[in-house]
């Protein structure tokens, strides 16, 4: 199909930066000023994409690629190619329709994004609470009960070797 | 405006050379394919050379290896320079400018006016 396609079309064969001008007998034109072509081809070329607000340019458009968007200090980009900017909080806050909101007792967040998620319950996995849990970091489990237990060893002692050739004593 | 001025034509003996020029302006010719082609008295236009703006060439198969087809993207021109010429490569050279870059099947955009190639003894 390709094949087909570009022995049909007379725009094939323009490079990506240029589009196929029908104004002009489609001979391949430059991309004006503020817009790109990523890929040969092309009718016409994309509008640049503008960096305002909330968001800063992290990379430049040129004839060939968009331009690429993060956000300013105090927030952080969601979505794909960063389609939208949302609030920073503190560790161990969420963000809310109110605001930034601390994380209710018994969950966390250490990021500066993100929502407020439960600590970890050691006991079911048989363990026990080693370092409690704050606001801004989960739990920290330490070994269950059992393997504390006087006698109780978390090594098993390897079974003597045997020397090949000899019968055991 | 586009335009195709063709220069570098003449009277030449059969087995001679000569390089024809084809200065370009009014449109970004070096994202673009050029060509030329000859027509010889009574009969059709047809296909000479074309080079892409990427230097890939296509030549007609009477004249690959006597013709080379180059171009110069700072001097905004396309040669042609013609090698062990023939009586049957009489004809007006004209320059075109292609449609969308392309050498495969081309198809012109623009024409220059063309220069006369006469070869006789």
């Known amino acids: 199909f390709e094949r087909t396609r570009s022995l049909q079309d007379p725009c094939s064969n323009c490079p990506a930066g240029t589009f196929c001008d029908n104004n002009r007998n489609q001979i391949c034109s430059p991309c004006p000023p503020n817009s790109f072509s990523s890929a040969g081809g092309q009718r016409t070329c994309d509008i640049c994409r503008q960096c305002k607000g909330v968001f800063r340019t992290r990379k430049e458009c040129s004839s060939t690629s968009n331009a690429e968007c993060d956000c300013t200090p105090g927030f952080h980009c969601l979505g794909a190619g960063c389609s939208m900017c949302e609030q920073d909080c503190k560790q161990g806050q969420e963000l809310t329709k109110k605001g930034c909101k601390d994380c209710c007792f018994g969950t966390f967040n250490d990021q500066k994004r993100g929502i407020c998620r439960p600590w970890t319950n050691c006991s079911l996995d048989g363990k026990s609470v080693l370092v409690n849990g704050t606001k801004e970091r989960d739990v920290v489990c330490g070994p269950s009960p059992a393997d504390l237990s006087p006698g109780a060893s978390s090594v098993t002692p390897p079974a003597p070797a045997r020397e090949p050739g000899h019968s055991p004593q | 405006e586009v335009q195709l001025l063709e220069s570098g034509g003449g009277e030449v003996q059969p087995g001679g050379s000569l390089r024809l020029s084809c200065a370009a302006s009014?449109?970004?010719?070096?994202?673009?394919?050029m060509g030329w082609y000859r027509q010889a008295p009574g009969k059709r236009r047809e296909f000479v050379a074309a080079i892409e703006s990427g230097s890939n060439t296509v030549y007609a198969e009477s004249v690959k290896g006597r013709f080379t087809i180059s171009r110069d993207n700072a001097k905004n021109t396309v040669y042609l320079q013609m090698s062990s010429l023939r009586a049957e490569d009489t004809a007006v050279y004209y320059c075109g400018l292609l449609k969308g870059n392309r050498v495969v099947s081309p198809s012109v955009a623009y024409w220059g006016q063309g220069t006369l190639v006469t070869v006789k003894p």
């Open positions: 009014g449109f970004s010719f070096s994202i673009n394919a």
